[in-house]
């Protein structure tokens, strides 16, 4: 079951998935000036059995210089804040992902892919929050959010994280500070359009990936 909303927005924080549950879809988006190949897929799908998960279908982009069949439209200002764009970084696979049954690792980049990735999460997906550069975390509990099904509707749990002040460096180096969303924005208003980038993890992490993630070093 697909999650209808986005994970909640925390001011001065970004979220990432460490691994993607089976059923997750990743749109095959191409950068400006390129389009999906004629017979290409619209998306890749995380799929598998009890012992192995992988991304099904390949995204492929080709130059649209001769004929532009994929119209890339610049979002309107009100849409841009919904899109949570984050730049792609050079991929380094988190080593622990393979040990999570029923999950796929971050897919490797494809040639001429767009600068952001649009994921569609499924029920049971967990994402982790960290404060952006210049802000430090005040924890009241787990800094994570899970997509849950309640009374036939999907919802994301509220992460117990406040990002405050300056101090401390970002644990997502190289990322620009995102626009902080208005405080108290109801979860139901958030978009399900999920854009994210690769985690660059140096040290191996526990498969349970609880809040200890925040003590992990990132390079």
């Amino acid at each position: 079951e697909l999650c209808d909303d986005d994970p909640p927005e925390i001011p001065h924080a970004t979220f990432k998935a460490m691994a993607y549950k089976e059923g997750t879809m990743l749109n095959c988006e191409c950068k400006r000036g390129f389009r999906r190949i004629k017979s290409g897929s619209l998306y890749m799908l995380c799929t598998g059995n009890s012992s192995h998960s992988s991304w099904d279908n390949q995204c492929q982009c080709t130059s649209s210089a001769t004929r532009n069949t994929t119209k890339q439209v610049t979002p309107q200002p009100e849409e841009q804040k919904e899109r949570k764009t984050t730049e792609m970084q050079s991929p380094m696979q988190p080593v622990d992902q393979a040990s999570l049954p029923g999950h796929c690792r971050e897919p490797p980049p494809w040639e001429n892919e767009a600068t952001e990735r649009i994921y569609h999460f499924v029920v049971g997906q967990m994402v982790y929050y960290q404060c952006v550069q210049g802000y430090r975390a005040l924890h009241r509990g787990p800094a994570e959010s899970v997509c849950k099904m309640t009374h036939g509707k999907t919802r994301w749990t509220q992460p117990q994280l406040i990002c405050t002040g300056e101090m401390e460096t970002s644990q997502f180096p190289g990322e620009e500070k995102p626009q902080a969303s208005p405080e108290g924005r109801p979860e139901s208003e958030t978009s399900c359009l999920v854009t994210t980038t690769d985690f660059q993890i140096q040290t191996e992490m526990a498969a349970t990936m609880e809040t200890s993630i925040f003590t992990t070093e990132y390079q």
């Epitope: 079951e1 290409g40 897929s41 619209l42 799929t47 099904d56 890339q72 979002p75």
Partner: antibody, heavy 116, light 108 residues
């Protein structure tokens, strides 16, 4: 609950153009691919094309390039399909359908009749 | 483009009978992108089975799907009168998406 409400029956002259709508409710419109499908009377289903409202990314069946144009207005949660240079062959029911896990929701269809 | 061929084109069955409809693809497709739809006269198609074998919400357990590569099938364990409809397979593995020609299931 999820609903796709399509515009009503259209009667058009050959050579004319028509624009039909598909208003989505009950879900975040920008986050699902919206497909359009044609069904001629007593015939099967034919895929026309698809639009991703989040960024207006489109893909078409080669057969309908130049015939159909897909657009979306996110503020109105509405997808549109414009058919141009109508002929009798375009007389059909046209469906919009959301792709989730398969095409999980369909509109009720817009009937287009081309007649002089 | 991938051509999907359904057989039979038409069939009549009695309540309680087991029904199997096949869908053959012109080239191999991933089972994750093969879906089945049911369309009753005068109505829009309805998702029946997604990704080859997963029952869509509200679909009775008498329906099942299987297959891989170029060969897929839809089975109705015990035919009921309300199952009278046209059934379509569809692939979403590559653009353009394509549908099978349909199988019209009638009551004997």
């Amino acid at each position: 609950q999820v609903k796709l409400q399509q515009s009503g029956t259209v009667l058009a002259r050959p050579g004319a153009s028509v624009k039909m709508s598909c208003k989505a409710s009950g879900y975040r419109f920008t986050n699902y691919w919206m497909h359009w499908v044609k069904q001629r009377p007593g015939q099967g289903l034919e895929w026309i094309g698809v639009i991703y409202p989040g960024n207006s990314d489109t893909s078409y069946n080669q057969k309908f390039k130049g015939k159909a144009k897909l657009t979306a207005v996110t503020s109105a949660s509405t997808a549109y399909m414009e058919l141009s240079s109508l002929t009798n062959e375009d007389s059909a029911v046209y469906y919009c359908t959301r792709e989730g896990e398969g095409s999980d929701y369909w509109g009720q269809g817009t009937t287009v009749t081309v007649s002089s | 483009q991938i051509v999907l061929t359904q057989s039979p084109a038409t069939m009549a069955a009695s309540p309680g009978e087991k029904i199997t409809i096949t869908c053959s693809a012109s080239s191999s497709i991933s089972s994750n992108y093969l879906h089945w739809y049911q369309q009753k006269p005068g109505f829009s198609p309805k998702l029946l089975i997604y990704r080859t074998s997963n029952l869509a919400s509200g679909v009775p357990a008498r329906f099942s799907g299987s297959g891989s590569g170029t060969s897929y099938s839809l089975t109705i364990g015990t035919m009921e009168a309300e199952d009278v409809a046209t059934y379509y397979c569809q692939q979403g593995s590559s653009i353009p998406y394509t549908f099978g020609g349909g199988t019209k299931l009638e009551l004997k």
